[in-house]
Interface confidence: low
Amino acid sequence: GELETSDVVTVVLGQDAKLPCFYRGDSGEQVGQVAWARVDAGEGAQELALLHSKYGLHVSPAYEGRVEQPPPPRNPLDGSVLLRNAVQADEGEYECRVSTFPAGSFQARLRLRVLVPPLPSLNPGPALEEGQGLTLAASCTAEGSPAPSVTWDTEVKGTTSSRSFKHSRSAAVTSEFHLVPSRSMNGQPLTCVVSHPGLLQDQRITHILHVSFLAEASVRGLEDQNLWHIGREGAMLKCLSEGQPPPSYNWTRLDGPLPSGVRVDGDTLGFPPLTTEHSGIYVCHVSNEFSSRDSQVTVDVLDPQEDSGKQVDLVSAS
């Protein structure tokens, strides 16, 4: 007869490992007992269990509660055992020694691989601001055995760099994602993808990018200067900009205080029925934590009694 086993048994941390050992004997041969031992290099053999055909399973104290026979039905020639809740320290070489009658003793060895799935973590980099050069957006670290694979899934253009640190029984892999911040990246997902043979599917951690910026300011409302005449109602100026964080707006008049009756409502400046007193230079000041911008316009309220219209100047400054 001969022993059938596996050269390598691979199991994920925490799962049960079946250590196979089957004696394929000739007709009439019987298995008396199967002895399982751990036989790592440089150490003496450590008994796991003894599987006796008559007396049943005896588990050594060091493995009490962790070694069992596979569930029924059982073949009397099958000396396989289950090692419950595999831990990384279980990784190594195991031997089953089968005593048969009348053929004598047989032995076979296998190695147990315990895969340690990674628990990845994603750490965002420093605050991203438009105008910066190549900047760390995020780093992703995963440790496992064997070493996990760490990649990035994103529409954002950037560069990656990886490094790994080997420990005694595992390896930690860190991948960094660098980019040149631009406002178009705002709200874009940056996903760290960790692959490992101990995972049923890739693990993904998503970070949403936030890039601070402030667009140039401009003022709308003076497109048709002929509408700005004495007596007109509902005239307004609207300050246009965008930014991250969202900006705040402030209106001032360069050549004096805001006329009475003029309403400031965030980005909008609302006028009462127009008079010549409303003529002047108005400034919209836009700011957020990142930057500030100004845009100024000159309002000339036309008198319909006069023959010719006056020019309107728009000036934008930052």
Epitope: S6, A41, R111, P146
Partner: antibody, heavy 122, light 107 residues
Framework: QVQLQESGPGLVKPSGTLSLTCTVS??????????WAWIRQPPGKGLEWIGS???????YYNPSLKSRVTIYVDTSKNQFSLKLSSVTAADTAVYYC??????????????WGQGTMVTVSS | EIVLTQSPATLSVSPGERATLSCRAS??????LAWYQQKPGQAPRLLIY???SRATGIPDRFSGSGSGTDFTLTISRLEPEDFAVYYC?????????FGGGTKLEIK
């Protein structure tokens, strides 16, 4: 830097026994953490795993060759050897020895000898 | 035993272009798959292990992917020294087996 070097006769007669030795330099076979394997490649064909051995002497063989193969290790000489009995012309191949790390990655044959051509012919 | 089938048997590509080599296993090998490069008169050289991890000293133009039964080796920009025979190898189940190889030749 670990290096492997195969040695042995390049010509074996049919029905004879092929014997090769692999000498490991730059590292100790008995330091553990590695299996040591024999792999062969017939002319113009693919690779075939013959078997592997641990320094403790435990061996694993390809079932297709198991009845004819013996691999053993001599830690005092830092060598491991292959014996293949009852050879035929089909055993003509380049024979490589290789290192197989365990349990650390890469868990695949990462270092190979340069190979030795063995011809089975009368 | 697990049979590995590589395709195509021969692949003709121009230098600088991308090459994609396939390996299919007759049953799942999880991620226990490696890729080797072999040049005439030389021993195989380990490129990829664990299906997707590059071996030490292997340029990043080589990448591996897949798990279970379907695997791919990609060479992003072919250099003149990349033209060789490539083998996949499974070590998830005994006996350990190799694919029949893909010859990558200059177009």
């Amino acid at each position: 830097q670990v290096q492997l070097q195969e040695s042995g006769p390049g010509l074996v007669k049919p029905s004879g026994t092929l014997s090769l030795t692999c000498t490991v330099s730059g590292g100790s076979i008995s330091s553990g953490g590695y299996y040591w394997a024999w792999i062969r490649q017939p002319p113009g064909k693919g690779l075939e795993w013959i078997g592997s051995i641990y320094y403790t002497g435990s061996t694993y063989y390809n079932p297709s060759l198991k009845s004819r193969v013996t691999i053993y290790v001599d830690t005092s000489k830092n060598q491991f050897s292959l014996k293949l009995s009852s050879v035929t012309a089909a055993d003509t191949a380049v024979y490589y020895c290789a290192r197989d790390p365990f349990p650390e990655p890469p868990d695949a044959f990462d270092i190979w000898g340069q190979g030795t051509m063995v011809t089975v012919s009368s | 035993e697990i049979v590995l089938t590589q395709s195509p048997a021969t692949l003709s590509v121009s230098p600088g272009e991308r090459a994609t080599l396939s390996c299919r296993a007759s049953q799942s090998v999880s991620s226990n798959l490696a890729w080797y490069q072999q040049k005439p008169g030389q021993a195989p050289r380990l490129l990829i292990y664990g299906a997707s991890s590059r071996a030490t000293g292997i340029p990043d133009r080589f990448s591996g992917s897949g798990s279970g039964t379907d695997f791919t080796l990609t060479i992003s920009r072919l250099e003149p020294e990349d033209f060789a025979v490539y083998y996949c190898h499974q070590y998830g189940s005994s006996p350990l087996t190799f694919g029949g190889g893909t010859k990558l030749e200059i177009k």
